[in-house]
Each structure stands twice: as C-alpha cells, then as structure tokens.
Interface confidence: low
C-alpha cells in the first residue's frame, strides 16, 4: 500500500509519524481540534514542521479530497498582498475575501477562503518527510 | 548533512559584475527557499534576496535593479548575480537555507572585494 | 523595513559573570520570528536562538532568549570564554528581513 498509492495513511509507513499522511516527499498532519492562527502556527513549528504551504494546484487538489467544507488554516498571511508564511507569493490560486480585516488564509473541499485570524479553525501542518 | 557550499571570484573590478554559484547537499531546492545575504563592515549584515522552492525570487528593494537570483534543481545549484558593482559591495556574500521560522544553515561566504 | 537596534555594540564580561545585550525593533515583531545568530572571527553566522527563546541544536542551557513585541533580549547565566562572539539579533517577519548591529561580546 505505501509503494503503491501516491499518498497513504497507513501505519507501516515508516517516514511520516503516527497521525500524520504522507503524500510525494511531505507529511501532512490535519487537526482535529481547532485553534487561532498563531496558535496553529506555533503547533506546528513546535513539531518540526509549518502550517501548510500549497506549492501547485496539483497539490491543492490532492489536500483538498481529504477536506470537508470546515475550513482549516494554511500557513497564509495578507501582508500587503497575500503570501505563504515563508514569504513566497500565492500566485497559483485567488483567494476569497470579504473584510479587510480578514488577513489570514483558510482552506476547505471548495476553495481558498480569508478570515479573520482569531477564528478558531482546525488546520494543516506540513513537512518534509525524513 | 546540510550544506551550502558557495564558488565565486575574490576580486571584482568597479562597473563589472559578481557571479556567486551556491551548492546545496542535504536538503532539495524543491522543497527549501535559499537567501542570499551579504556582510560589510560599515553597514553590518544586509538581506539581499531570495529565491524559493517554487522557483519565485523576491529582492530587497535596494538591490532589485541589478540582482538575479537564479536556480537549477537537478544540480542543486542557485545563482547569484549583481551588476555595476562598486567599492561599497565590498563584501562577504552568503547563501542561507530557510528552515521557517529562521534561516538556519549559512554557506561558508564568498569574500569580494571590488577594486580596480 | 523594520529597524533592529543592539545594545551594546561592545561589551566585555568577566568569566561566571551574567550577561544580557538587548535587541528593540522600529515595530512589533512576532516572537516566533525574531531570531538571534552568534559569528566568531573567520566564521559565518550560526543560528543560536530562534523563536525568541528557543536554543538551537548544541547550544548550552546558559544561554537563554526572552522578549516580545519590540524588545528582546538574550541572556548568558554565567559567561564562558567560548561564548566571547559577535551576536546579532534578525526579524523574519516581513521583507525586507533584517539584522541588528551585533553585540560584542569579548572577556574582561
């Protein structure tokens, strides 16, 4: 199964932890209970890892079969123009956004979402597998 | 073990232009930014630029006119280049790999200096 | 651009002496992303403390990071000679990033 399928969530996998799906060359963890977005940041980067950064839309899809309409946080800020919590542009996707205080990105089944960043919201952790 | 080894001329002449090739091991530029920044000793340690995994450059505004920062994947190479140097860009130039939230592992530098 | 401003420039500490040398930034910095990185002479930079408060790999416990906001700090509980460097303290919030005018730090 780990061979043989793209992504996988199975326990014999040994290159991503428990509770984590691995997908190519990263480890994807989606949460269960739901924080703020610093608070999802900081969860993440204490586990050696980052709130999700989307490199393509091909990986956009795959994440996004895996989600239902909750939304969760992605590691995407409006700092004068939206950007990935490493600094790079989001240049692959728009983004939804009714407020301007809603500087913070969400991600469900459906689409890139802003919302205020003190929203509780479940979110995705991201790294590269070892 | 990580490593950003970096290959590029001591001596540059005013008005020419500084190529500074950094090589990567132990991480893959698919997955991880690469900054470049330079140290001087009037003005102390200067981020420049950055090329990320995707293959997108931002630069720091004061430079943006005459940097190119350049990759290939596959020989895990970036490229740095700076026009029209002059006296001032005297400098040691380093390629940093980003782990967020810092930039944690620093390439030996390369010490320029610009004069005729 | 936000301004990170160390001080001292210079300062010299007796061995077993506790040390701390501050970094103030123009405008509020996330804690998750102000950094500081030690250089001896003939080196490049090492990251030594990141996140505000969190050691890096291989660095002693004496040394300890603290701060929010726009004020920092970084604090050595009891001064050893390998720890006479140059610290410079960077914010990775926003671009351009930027470093502070190093701290050094020598032996009495």
């Known amino acids: 199964l780990c061979q043989g399928s793209k992504y996988s969530t199975c326990a014999s996998c040994p290159s991503c932890p428990d509770h984590w799906m691995k997908y190519g060359n990263h480890c994807y963890y989606f949460s269960v209970e739901k924080k703020d977005w610093i608070s999802s940041l900081e969860f993440c980067l204490a586990r050696d890892s980052h709130l999700l950064m989307i490199t393509d839309k091909q990986e956009m899809s795959l994440l996004q079969d895996f989600l239902s309409e909750a939304f969760h946080w992605v590691g995407l800020r409006n700092n004068s123009g939206w950007r990935w919590e490493d600094g790079s542009p989001l240049n692959f996707s728009r983004i939804y956004s009714n407020s301007l205080v809603q500087t913070c990105g969400a991600i469900n089944k459906n689409s890139l979402q802003a919302s205020s960043c003190e929203v509780s919201l479940q979110w995705v952790c991201k790294k590269v597998s070892p | 073990q990580v490593q950003l080894k970096q290959s590029g001329p001591g001596l540059v002449q005013p008005s020419q232009s500084l190529s500074i090739t950094c090589t990567v091991s132990g991480f893959s530029l698919t997955t991880h930014a690469v900054h470049w920044v330079r140290q001087s000793p009037g003005k102390g340690l200067d981020w420049l630029g950055v090329i990320w995994s995707g293959g997108n450059t931002d630069y720091n505004a004061a430079f943006i006119s005459r940097l190119t920062i350049s990759k290939d994947n596959s020989k895990s190479q970036v490229f740095f280049k700076m026009n029209s140097l002059q006296a001032d860009d005297t400098a040691i130039y380093y390629c940093?790999?980003?782990?967020?939230?810092?930039?944690?592992?620093w390439g030996q530098g390369t010490s320029v200096t610009v004069s005729s | 651009q936000i301004v990170l401003t160390q001080s001292p420039a210079i300062m010299s500490a007796s061995l077993g002496e506790r040390v701390t040398m501050t970094c103030t930034a123009t405008s509020s910095v996330s804690s998750t992303y102000l950094h500081w990185y030690r250089q001896k002479p003939g080196s490049s930079p090492k990251l030594w403390i990141y996140s505000t408060s969190t050691l890096a790999s291989g660095v002693p416990v004496r040394f300890r990071g603290s701060g929010s906001g726009t004020s920092y700090s970084l604090t050595i509980s009891s001064m050893e000679a390998e720890d006479a460097a140059t610290y410079y303290c960077?914010?990775?919030?926003?671009?351009?990033?930027?470093f502070g005018g190093g701290t050094k730090l020598e032996i009495k």
């Open positions: 940093v790999r980003l782990l967020l939230p810092a930039m944690d592992y």
């Open positions: 960077h914010q990775y919030r926003r671009s351009p990033y930027t």
